[in-house]
Amino acid sequence: SIPWNLERITPPRYRADEYQPPDGGSLVEVYLLDTSIQSDHREIEGRVMVTDFENVPEEDGTRFHRQASKCDSHGTHLAGVVSGRDAGVAKGASMRSLRVLNCQGKGTVSGTLIGLEFIRKSQLVQPVGPLVVLLPLAGGYSRVLNAACQRLARAGVVLVTAAGNFRDDACLYSPASAPEVITVGATNAQDQPVTLGTLGTNFGRCVDLFAPGEDIIGASSDCSTCFVSQSGTSQAAAHVAGIAAMMLSAEPELTLAELRQRLIHFSAKDVINEAWFPEDQRVLTPNLVAALPPSTHGAGWQLFCRTVWSAHSGPTRMATAIARCAPDEELLSCSSFSRSGKRRGERMEAQGGKLVCRAHNAFGGEGVYAIARCCLLPQANCSVHTAPPAEASMGTRVHCHQQGHVLTGCSSHWEVEDLGTHKPPVLRPRGQPNQCVGHREASIHASCCHAPGLECKVKEHGIPAPQGQVTVACEEGWTLTGCSALPGTSHVLGAYAVDNTCVVRSRDVSTTGSTSEEAVTAVAICCRSRHLAQASQELQ
Amino acid sequence: QEDEDGDYEELVLALRSEEDGLAEAPEHGTTATFHRCAKDPWRLPGTYVVVLKEETHLSQSERTARRLQAQAARRGYLTKILHVFHGLLPGFLVKMSGDLLELALKLPHVDYIEEDSSVFAQ
């Protein structure tokens, strides 16, 4: 019967007594940077070309015996998970292996860098189809390794890496912390984060998604027909590399940004038990388990968006945090979140010719996060319209005045320390969909976009008194682009998007007392692109 | 265990070269930075990735590496250029004493230097 991990990533329409989705990634080459591998194992023979690249440190210890099967164990298993005949994800994908890890599974940042450079040079000498690079390894945070990954990604290569097995914030490790890399955490058959001895899968905002990574059956280097079960974020990353290979084989022109958005979009949502993660990491960690798209050709008509969290600002009075979208994504909205509730809002601003989302800490605050909503919107022309604090009037207003521009998000930023003592800011596009309304002492920022066929609407959901969390979701066919809170009292910790749901968090006021005036409303801006939908129908 | 100095066998004890005196001084106002792994057991002191500024050509990378060797030799230090990077990042990998970091950070075109560190199968 089909192994649990292959069943988990397979949409129901492919499920039979065996895993055989269409097109096994045959147009794609997957590079594996790992240990040596047993390339003629029955499961992978003819699928893996062992390059002559080898850059590994000496094994530790004077009495270390190089036993071939042990030296090949990790890499052989991963090659099998990616493209194995019987237990592989992308059965048609061809692979090339580079040896950067020694027989003890240890390598160096410099060896990995030279390996990545080798791949780039190979790509230049003999350009082929789409390339996926699998990095099933992790070390401490490395500026240079992250930089090399960024360069390779900008050259059109898709990099997939293990989040790390340290039960820790993946942002403390490389290449997991590189924003351009697709970073994968591990879950088990019960959709629980994987525990590995006293440690387990890494987590946090640097993880893009999770994938099966416990008791994964794959090729064993013990013999040419042997299989073995292994666990780890390497195995999880290998699943995503396989899924990426299949997606790219079906749509070879996909950019990295498009691929990442599709991986997120087609993932199983909200199935991971978040209680396993440290409390302060739960909101930052994506609750997504990778899966293949339900059809070979992905939903090109869809407006894809994802949520990007910044690093924590730190607690200083003037501290700020910045969240950035990938180069070919549009920042459609910006929100902020603070566990203490002490923040001074957020704003969208240009930095290096690109919009970024900046959140501001407030005096006495423990720090803030900026949350960017990053979307794929072809031919978009987006701008930010800002209204300075209105001071005297009832509130500050700003709208999208250009013809054909629609409102995709509202942000509010204030200089006063605590708006809770003032009339609360109101980001209220209601009634006038192209308008943001806010507190008279706040500057209000409207994200206004023009794109073919783009239409947006506002959805609100309010509850009489703050109850910790208020949500509002966009309906089927619409995509959440903006998420904000009404009102913005000191009770409100912030707003952020989780998949297609706008979440507004507020302090539990059972201890502080509340009034009906302090009702909290979650405001979602939901958009869709008729142009993309029409283009997709014409293709069919 | 093999002789730890084995790696140094091919080291070039670079003598002061004419080129050494001619190389450009580092640009004013830009200070190269040094980075190392926050996890102490994973550090590999003695090997450093010298990353040069983005538009640096291969010939400049090689020249900078040679200049480091020459200046180190003048101070009585052996260095070994293990690899010159080009294609992804401009720079070079050098085996040298940590005593030379201050000197290396002052070389022209240097953006930052990172001490090598371990990575592990996950």
């Epitope: 065996e18 055989q20 047993q38 390339s39 003629d40 029955r42 023979e45 003819g46 893996v48 070309m49 062992v50 071939a68 005949r85 019987d86 059965k91 013999c223 040419s224 027909t225 | -």
Partner: antibody, heavy 115, light 109 residues
Amino acid sequence: QVQLVQSGAEVKKPGASVKVSCKASGYPLTSYGISWVRQAPGQGLEWMGWISAYNGNTNYAQKVQGRVTMTTDTSTSTVYMELRSLRSDDTAVYYCARGYGMDVWGQGTTVTVSS
Amino acid sequence: QSALTQPASVSGSPGQSITISCTGTSSDVGGYNSVSWYQQHPGKPPKLMIYEVSNRPSGVSNRFSGSKSGNTASLTISGLQAEDEADYFCSSYTSTSMVFGGGTKLTVL
């Protein structure tokens, strides 16, 4: 192009040994092992075993285990199959084929065991 | 006695379609994606026609197709031609080895 070239026909007496060679070319040798298959006159195909060109590991069919030895010489890209204690029912055409997938075959070597 | 069961012979007229079955168990055909089909003309080595149940190597006519259901694999030849007359063998992985079918003689009438 990908090729497997085998040694010539052999006539052996019962109890003797035979060693058939198979020279591989045109592909990365370590990406595939070599399978050996035999076919008795007028009969079907019988898989005898496999040898790794990567590390020399072998996987023999139970029926010939103990009588067969497969070896490789990586310097000449040649694989050998030696069958000992020959019997008359070992008379067959012996083929080498690439990997377990057996996508490329040698031309065959006829081994006749007769007293 | 071969591990996989094939009909001893099948026949068909030119232009017709024929199907050859190959029946095994859940330990071979049913348990793996690696069923292959070989064509063998007299005095020649076998030639791979189908691999991994339904894939055709380059150079093999698209008149040849493979499929599998449960423990039985099938080879279908459509638009039968005179040169298709040959012996056909199926093979499958087992947990540690390979097994062949006894072979099917295809006669083109």
